[in-house]
């Protein structure tokens, strides 16, 4: 997955720090106070849709075969720049019953981006 | 994740059968001859971006908080209808050395769709 460097507009991973205070979640999230969530941004021209390295690669490569052949409805289906590899992160928070919970929350951090 | 029923244009899972013969892969894939790959289609209005049930939900909910507040650059970032749950499938095929391999291939079948 590409890291965005400002030079290309192809699908890439952009660094982004999330502050739980900014989004009003600091009342129930004890730790961390924020984290590098990152996000995906950029174009997905047909020639890079379903590019390998993406966790969606088999499925998206198959769909791309149909898309490239102008097969309805895939010809109009837009390929999207989306997270293809996400990582969990440990969090400490209050649950609904005000119990203190430490848990690995899945899919918190975007590690790689690709074209769906 | 919604199943597409033709009545809504909200992000949903559409049934789709892939024929390996159609895409010219039947020369190296022994079995199956095709499979229900499915795909994702539909709109992702801001109010359903990062909807729960999506494997991207924590990350996309966080990003959606910024998007809903018109935070640059998320205000212009398009939420996409993408696979959020994929399933592996067993395949029998020839590898590069013409050996017959049976293997579970990850991320072949779209089980659920959601808004990134």
């Amino acid at each position: 997955g590409l890291e965005c460097d400002g030079k290309v507009n192809i699908c890439c991973k952009k660094q982004f720090f999330v502050s739980f205070k900014d989004i009003g979640w600091n009342d129930w999230i004890i730790a961390p106070s924020g984290y590098h969530a990152n996000y995906c941004e950029g174009e997905c021209p047909s020639h890079i849709a379903g590019t390998s390295g993406s966790s969606l690669s088999f499925h998206s490569t198959v769909i791309n075969h149909y898309r490239m052949r102008g097969h309805s409805p895939f010809a109009n289906l837009k390929s999207c720049c989306v997270p293809t590899k996400l990582r969990p992160m440990s969090m400490l928070y209050y649950d609904d019953g005000q119990n203190i919970i430490k848990k690995d929350i899945q899919n918190m951090i975007v590690e790689e981006c690709g074209c769906s | 994740g919604l199943e597409c029923d033709g009545k809504v244009n909200i992000c949903c899972k559409k049934q789709f059968f892939v024929s390996f013969k159609d895409i010219g892969w039947n020369d190296w894939i022994i079995a199956p001859s095709g499979y229900h790959a499915n795909y994702c289609e539909g709109e992702c209005p801001s109010h359903i971006a990062g909807t729960s049930g999506s494997s991207l939900s924590f990350h996309s909910t966080v990003i959606n908080h910024y998007r809903m507040r018109g935070h640059s650059p998320f205000a212009n970032l398009k939420s996409c209808c993408v696979p959020t749950k994929l399933r592996p499938m067993s395949m029998l095929y020839y590898d590069d050395g013409q050996n017959i391999i049976k293997k579970d291939i990850q991320n072949m079948i779209v089980e659920e769709c959601g808004c990134s």
């Epitope: 739980f20 205070k21 600091n26 999230i29 004890i30 730790a31 961390p32 106070s33 924020g34 440990s90 969090m91 400490l92 203190i100 919970i101 430490k102 | -």
Partner: antibody, heavy 118, light 107 residues
């Protein structure tokens, strides 16, 4: 480098309170939690609670709830632990420690000896 | 609260010996376990976290293993500076709890 410098030894009478300070340096104070752990003479380690300067939360072990107060002063990068209604069983060395990861204490202060005696 | 049980409570060994300390959790803590070394009159020092990851600067003769409920700290070749108390601690759930400690002393 990361350092946690604690206040000096204290001698207190039963029923009194003690306030121990822990000044940190070498990292951003609000980026990590400070845990407080005590050790009675010849005994093991006992976690008392923690303060999370980034989010403003404090969490305490049940045993100390109502008797301990953990505070912070972000202007001086200092954490405090106050224990009230002291008993002889509170005689111990009190350590502050930085949490590198949640509940994992990677850097420790040298400790503050608190003696409770009439 | 999760109970942590260490054994043995003390072990006598010589320089060069291989020493093994075990720690058992009262419930599954996956790999959320840390090991600390404490010398007399000193503060504890983190040796191992996530059950098997060596903290920066800790000699490679120290190693940790295990997951779930059973964990081990191994010192492959005991050095004079390794005579100390060792504590395991679970970091899986609130509140974090320590084992009772193991004293490694000179034979």
């Amino acid at each position: 480098q990361v350092q946690l410098v604690q206040s000096g030894a204290e001698v207190k009478k039963p029923g009194a309170s003690v306030k121990v300070s822990c000044k940190v340096s070498g990292y951003t104070f609000t980026s990590s939690a400070i845990s407080w752990v005590r050790q009675a003479p010849g005994k093991g380690l006992e976690w008392m609670g923690g303060i999370y300067p980034g989010s403003g939360h404090t969490i305490y072990a049940q045993k100390f709830q109502g008797r301990v107060t953990m505070t912070e002063d972000t202007s001086t990068d200092t954490a405090y632990m106050e224990l009230s209604s002291l008993k002889s069983e509170d005689t111990a060395v009190y350590y502050c420690a930085r949490e590198g990861d949640i509940f994992v204490m990677d850097v420790w202060g040298l400790g503050t000896a608190v003696t409770v005696s009439s | 609260d999760i109970q942590m049980t260490q054994s043995p409570s003390s072990v006598s060994a010589s320089v060069g010996d291989r020493v093994t300390i075990t720690c058992r959790a009262s419930m599954d803590i996956r790999n959320d376990l840390a090991w600390y070394q404490q010398k007399p009159g000193k503060a504890p020092k983190l040796l191992i976290y996530d059950a098997s990851k060596l903290e920066t600067g800790v000699p490679s003769r120290f190693s940790g293993s295990g997951s779930g409920t059973d964990f081990t700290l191994t010192i492959s070749s005991l050095q004079p500076e390794d005579f100390a108390n060792y504590y395991c601690q679970q970091a899986k759930s609130f509140p974090p709890t320590f084992g009772g400690g193991t004293k490694v002393e000179i034979k």
